[in-house]
Structures are given as C-alpha cells and as structure tokens.
C-alpha cells in the first residue's frame, strides 16, 4: 500500500499541454502510475505515464493536440487523477478538478536575438511560444542580465508590465560579455506562475572607441 503525504500539481501551457508533478512520501519507486485527464465537456480524454524525477516525485506531460491548437477554453474544467497499478487493479492516489486557465504556466520565450548592440546598450527581442490568443496583450515579462563575476540569482529583475517582446538594456560596460534571460506570465489565473526562464542569450558590448571618453 502507498501512504504518506501526497501533492499533485499541474499547469496548463494555454494551448495543448498540461504538465503535472505528483509527489508522495513513502511511495514505492517501482510502482507504475499515470495521470488521467477527463474534460467535463469534451469527447476526448488523455493519459500520460508518470516518470520519476526525484526520490519521491514523478512528472508527466499530457499532450492534448498539436502544439498551437486551442484544446481547452476558459470554461473547461478537467478532472485530473493519479492512478497507480496495484497488482491487476488501478488505485486512485490523487484527484483534482482542474481549471486550466486558473493554473497557467506558459512555455519559455524563444528566438532571443540581439537586434542592435553598442558600447553601453543592447536591444534584444524574443518571441512567446505556444501562447493562447486569448491573452491579447495582457502578459507581463521579467528579464535579467548576467554580468561578469555574478550569478543569475544576484541579477536584478527587470519587469515589463505589458506584452513587450523586446528590451533595451542600458548602462552596460563596453567590450564585456553578458548573458540575458526572459520569462513570461499571463495576468489571468489565481494559481498562474512564471514560465521557465528562456535559454540564455550571450552577447558582447562593443569596445569603446580609442581616444574617446567612455
């Protein structure tokens, strides 16, 4: 038998993916478990196999359709269950009535690129990926720049309170290597959280012109 404290957390990427993590203290590592998704008003259902990510937690992705298809709407409620095999039977370990657009985590921004770089500033753009058209412009971004000799955790956060897919970094040091990351979050959703950080974009500022003050 499996007992102990259970935690079952899922997020919708706003298009065609629900990612879930289930953690259970005292769970058996070799138990076969799945997440089952049953929307309240749709003809389809979906299952994914939970795979271990640590000693007592498992994760899986419910793929609902092609990446950019709008598979759930603002009024859908999805019953999500963790089912684990016990011999020849399946036992329900966790259940939740999941409101997709109250539990959002978008994909990390992609296609980061340097639009223009100078000695002291750099203009960077990016794109959002697999984000619903539902949000219109009601998204916010956080960005951070990694300076030499510092860690990402030390980097101050810059907040963009609107759907602005570019930033102009100022007061940079000439001829210096930097890295840049950005993440996105919709305003919608009580339990919505930030996307993962984008892949870092490395760039170098231009050297100061010789014989000029910098």
């Amino acid at each position: 038998a499996v007992n102990g404290t259970s935690r079952f957390t899922c997020f919708y990427n706003s298009r065609a993916n629900i990612s879930c993590v289930w953690s259970q203290d005292g769970a058996l590592q070799d138990t076969s478990c799945q997440v089952h998704a049953w929307p309240d008003r749709r003809r389809w259902n979906q299952t994914c196999e939970l795979l271990p990510v640590s000693q007592a937690s498992w994760a899986c992705n419910l793929i609902l359709g092609t990446p950019d298809s709008q598979k759930l709407t603002a009024v859908d409620i999805v019953t999500l269950r963790v089912m684990c095999r016990e011999g020849v039977r399946w036992r329900m370990m966790a259940i939740q009535d999941f409101k997709p657009f109250e539990n959002l985590r978008l994909m990390a921004p992609i296609s980061l690129q340097v639009v223009h770089v100078e000695t002291h500033r750099c203009n960077i753009s990016w794109k959002i990926s697999q984000a619903s058209h539902y949000f219109e412009r009601h998204l916010e971004f956080e960005a951070r720049t990694l300076s030499p000799g510092h860690t990402w955790e030390e980097a101050p956060l810059m907040t963009l309170k609107q759907k602005q897919e570019w930033i102009c970094l100022e007061t940079l040091t000439p001829d210096t290597q930097y890295e840049f990351q950005v993440r996105v979050k919709p305003l919608q959703g009580e339990f919505t959280t930030w996307s993962p950080w984008s892949q870092p974009l490395a760039f170098r500022t231009k050297p100061a012109a010789l014989g000029k003050d910098t």
Epitope: S69, Q70, T73, A74, V75, F101, E102, H133, Y134, F135, E136, H138, L187, Q188, E190
Partner: antibody, heavy 117, light 107 residues
Framework: EVQLVQSGAEVKKPGATVKISCKVS????????VHWVQQAPGKGLEWMGW????????EYAPGFQDRVTITADTSTDTAYMELSSLRSEDTAVYYC??????????WGQGTTVTVSS | EIVMTQSPATLSVSPGERATLSCRAS??????LHWYQQKPGQAPRLLII???QSISGIPARFSGSRSGTEFTLTISSLQSEDFAVYFC?????????FGQGTKLEIK
C-alpha cells in the same frame, strides 16, 4: 484603430428571428474572440456567448443557448448573432465586443432590437 | 450562477471629490473581476481588469482593490466626464455575470 461596426436597428414580431452583423477592423479577426452581450431595460447586461474565429468554436450562456447562434465569416471579418423565437423581453440593445474570454476590451456601437406585435 | 451586487445603486458626489463604488460577489471569484464605465447612448468601456490592473489609456484616477469577495472601484478626484454608470463583471464561473450598475451623478 480597433473598430466593431454593427448593423442597424430592427423591429420584429414575436416568434420571429433576428440576425445582427458585426464587421470588425483594426485587428486580426482570426486571432480573436467576438462576444455578444444583451442590455435589456429591466435586466441589465447579460453575456450571450462568443465565437473563437481561430477555430470556429462557440460558447453560449445557458440562458441563451437554446435560441442563439453565433457565427463568423473570416473572409469578410464579420461576426453574426442570430436570436430566434423572439419575445417581448428580448427587446434590448445588443452589443458585439472583442476580447479574450474573460472581459471585453472593445465594443460595437450597439444594435437596438424591438420585439412588438 | 454567480450574483454580483453593486452598491449603492446611485451615488451623488461633487466634482473634485473621491467616489467609492462597491461590488460584492455571491461566492469567491479570486481576482476575476472587471470594471466598465457606460455613458448614456454609448457602449460600455473597459476600465480595470483582474480587480486592480488598469487598462492603458484609462486615467490614473481610476483604481481598483479587493477584499475577499468585495471589490472597490475608486475615482480619486471626479471630473465632469466621469459621471456615468459603472458595472462590475465576474469571469470566475461561466456564465460570466455583471452587476446591476451604480449610477454616479453630480451632487
């Protein structure tokens, strides 16, 4: 500039059907939801439903779903709302609006429908 | 269906003064509450989303707040163009529903 331009006022007899159009401009029609809202004198604002032009999916409020049909013509960037089996309490101003599912960012000018025998 | 109750039905305030409009939900709606302004003969106009987020182009004198199921729209210093009817709207449970409106009139 975002604009939603609705068809003109209608006078209908009880039991008839009315169809109102909403021509949109200033944004990508295929990337948007068009909603319909009723504002009747004694009842206030009531959400009727919406259509998602990206995939043609509709959502109707329970109080209207038996009588309302929302459609969209992506070739002309026009949404339509058809209300059947009209009764006197359907006398109202009907608005189309653009927005995500949760709130209405831009509104049409409204279409007055009078139901009278 | 969630019932949205606005109070007062009519509010009389002098220009330059502060106006406080209330909207209460019949059940918990998180921050899924939006405010609109409607002037006679016009369509409603979106002012505030998610309880407190201002829409671009809306003057800074309009602000929103939340305490549990009670939401407040505050207009800090009333201008002549602010006298109108104000509606709240919830988007927590379908069908989305509106309050009956508060008419803000000149005192």
């Amino acid at each position: 500039e975002v604009q939603l331009v609705q068809s003109g006022a209608e006078v209908k007899k009880p039991g008839a059907t009315v169809k109102i159009s909403c021509k949109v401009s200033g944004f990508n029609f295929k990337d948007s939801l068009v909603h319909w809202v009723q504002q009747a004198p004694g009842k206030g604002l009531e959400w009727m439903g919406w259509i998602d032009s990206e995939n043609g999916e509709t959502e109707y409020a329970p109080g209207f779903q038996d009588r309302v049909t929302i459609t969209a013509d992506t070739s002309t960037d026009t949404a339509y709302m058809e209300l059947s089996s009209l009764r006197s309490e359907d006398t109202a101003v009907y608005y189309c609006a653009r927005g995500g599912p949760w709130f209405l960012s831009y509104w049409g000018q409204g279409t007055t429908v009078t139901v009278s025998s | 269906e969630i019932v949205m109750t606005q109070s007062p039905a009519t509010l009389s305030v002098s220009p330059g003064e502060r106006a406080t409009l209330s909207c209460r939900a019949s059940q918990i709606i998180s921050n899924n509450l939006h405010w609109y302004q409607q002037k006679p003969g016009q369509a409603p106009r979106l002012l505030i989303i998610y309880g407190l987020q201002s829409i671009s182009g809306i003057p800074a004198r309009f602000s929103g707040s939340r305490s549990g199921t009670e939401f407040t729209l505050t207009i800090s210093s009333l201008q002549s163009e602010d006298f109108a009817v104000y509606f709240c709207q919830q988007s927590n449970n379908w069908p989305w529903t509106f309050g009956q409106g508060t008419k803000l009139e000149i005192k």
